[in-house]
Interface confidence: medium
């Protein structure tokens, strides 16, 4: 899966734009597309054959400071009878996300981009069977 | 599209630091935690009972400019025999991510935060059965 590239070159030089001099850019922190009224069916996490719960991680020096991380409920998957089937595995799907890290420096807070690997939900997979020699 | 949520203005650091009224901050775009040797198992997308493919979306005015979005391969789920079971549904797990949007489009070093809803993978769920009256 294609993860966001380091970006400095991408941000510094779009097309024929001259490169940035100090690796910093100005960012307007008013968020566009905030929420958009999108309602994501909550019950996926419970109706899934690989159900999961959310843990909220909090970090006051990170933006966003609250991030919901998924945790698979079982090691196996839930079959049609509602029983755990250990011949299949519940695994977390991971996604790289960008966050901002605050580094206090007197009155002028400085911020930098940081990558985080986030578990976003679970899926049911066939285990890899290693054949004995 | 939802306009700036800046409205919920921000709190400032202890001391006598004046708050900013222009809603912009300087961000160092050299990424922390870049690559950390994290490897996201690619084969989940094929071994899952709700397999998916990735489409790469490209936008030169966005950072990251390339983002991989998942698309479920089937409407049903794949059973132990490798057949599609239409009594279950493959659904995309969605995740909010932060991106930087270049404004105005061009060589400007000004960006704004934008939230995007991204399909990151698929999971197999029991459909909701609506009882007839």
């Amino acid at each position: 899966r294609k993860n966001p590239k380091a970006g400095v070159p991408a941000l510094q030089k779009a097309g024929n734009c001259p490169p940035l001099e100090d690796n910093t850019v100005r960012v307007d922190i008013r968020i566009f597309n905030q929420n958009q009224g999108i309602s994501v069916p909550r019950e996926f996490q419970n109706r899934s054959s690989s159900p999961w719960d959310y843990n909220i991680t909090r970090d006051p020096h990170r933006f966003p400071s609250e991030i919901a991380e998924a945790q698979c409920r079982h090691s196996g998957c839930i079959n049609a009878q509602g029983q755990e089937d250990s011949t299949m595995n519940s695994v977390a799907i991971q996604q790289e996300i960008l966050v901002l890290r605050r580094e206090p420096q007197g009155c002028s807070n400085s911020f930098r981009l940081e990558k985080m690997l986030l578990k976003v939900g679970c899926t049911c997979v066939k285990p890899i069977v290693h054949q004995a020699a | 599209r939802k306009n700036p949520k800046a409205g919920v203005p921000a709190l400032q650091k202890a001391g006598n630091c004046p708050p900013l009224e222009d809603n912009t901050v300087r961000v160092d775009i050299r990424i922390f935690n870049q690559n950390q040797g994290i490897s996201v198992p690619r084969e989940f997308q094929n071994r899952s009972s709700s397999p998916w493919d990735y489409n790469i979306t490209r936008d030169p005015h966005r950072f990251p400019s390339e983002i991989a979005e998942a698309q479920c391969r089937h409407s049903g789920c794949i059973n132990a025999q490798g057949q599609e079971d239409s009594t279950m549904n493959s659904v995309a797990i969605q995740q909010e991510i932060l991106v930087l949007r270049r404004e105005p489009q061009g060589c400007s070093n000004s960006f704004r935060l934008e939230k995007m809803l991204l399909k990151v993978g698929c999971t197999c769920v029991k459909p909701i059965v609506h009882q007839a009256a």
């Epitope: 922190i29 905030q34 | 932060l98």
Partner: antibody, heavy 127, light 107 residues
Framework: QVQLVQSGAEVKKPGSSVKVSCKAS????????FSWVRQAPGQGLEWMGG????????NYAQKFQGRVTITADESTNTAYMELSSLRSEDTAVYYC????????????????????WGQGTTVTVSS | EIVLTQSPDFQSVTPKEKVTITCRAS??????LHWYQQKPDQSPKLLIK???QSFSGVPSRFSGSGSGTDFTLTINSLEAEDAAAYYC?????????FGQGTKVEIK
């Protein structure tokens, strides 16, 4: 569970200033954004402005621009709203309210809106 | 600024009746509209966020709908404890604004 506790009632003379505080207990100030909303007697709610602690940025409604100053002190987990050049029509209950929306990410399920409000501070402006 | 106009200003309703309050925005605000309930001498409480999403702990008789410029708050089967003022609020663009409020009284 976060609670917002505001300072007590104030009686002020026209032309003076008032500074209302809003202390967040049970949570970190910088993890949220805050708005100040006022309500004159028998009237509706009016948004005055707000502050995003993490970034140290503020926004004010045009009506109050130049008279209102919103600040916060992360060391004491307290937000402040100061209103100057008071007049009789500033007599109102002043509320601080927390907005968690801005700070959440991860799952699109975690939306809150102005979910926690202070108890309100009555400011009376009278000569 | 975006002006929110609620109607009616006042409604006197008998218990178990259905109450409908509308909120019209002077320009499109997508789904960025929220509803609050305020009882006498109390702080406002969030009921519905983003037009239709119920806030946790809010009774299921409260529901919201709409997008763009026209929004509705519905109270199905009104209870005595629902006597309050109801306000719509937009967070689509600055400055944030509220509707003038609708007072619901129990007959």
């Amino acid at each position: 569970q976060v609670q917002l506790v505001q300072s007590g009632a104030e009686v002020k003379k026209p032309g003076s200033s008032v500074k209302v505080s809003c202390k967040a207990s049970g949570g970190t100030l910088s993890s949220y954004a805050f708005s100040w909303v006022r309500q004159a007697p028998g009237q509706g709610l009016e948004w005055m402005g707000g502050i995003i602690p993490f970034f140290g940025t503020v926004n004010y409604a045009q009506k109050f621009q130049g008279r209102v100053t919103i600040t916060a002190d992360e060391s004491t987990n307290t937000a402040y709203m100061e209103l100057s050049s008071l007049r009789s029509e500033d007599t109102a209950v002043y509320y601080c309210a927390r907005d968690r929306d801005y700070y959440g990410l991860g799952s699109p399920l975690h939306y809150y809106g102005l979910d926690v409000w202070g108890q309100g501070t009555t400011v009376t402006v009278s000569s | 600024e975006i002006v929110l106009t609620q109607s009616p200003d006042f409604q006197s309703v008998t218990p178990k009746e259905k109450v409908t309050i509308t909120c019209r925005a002077s320009q499109s605000i997508g789904s960025s509209l929220h509803w609050y309930q305020q009882k006498p001498d109390q702080s406002p409480k969030l009921l519905i966020k983003y037009a239709s999403q119920s806030f946790s702990g809010v009774p299921s008789r409260f529901s919201g709908s709409g997008s763009g410029t026209d929004f509705t708050l519905t109270i199905n089967s009104l209870e005595a404890e629902d006597a309050a003022a109801y306000y719509c609020h937009q967070s689509s663009s600055l400055p944030w604004t509220f509707g003038q409020g609708t007072k619901v009284e129990i007959k």
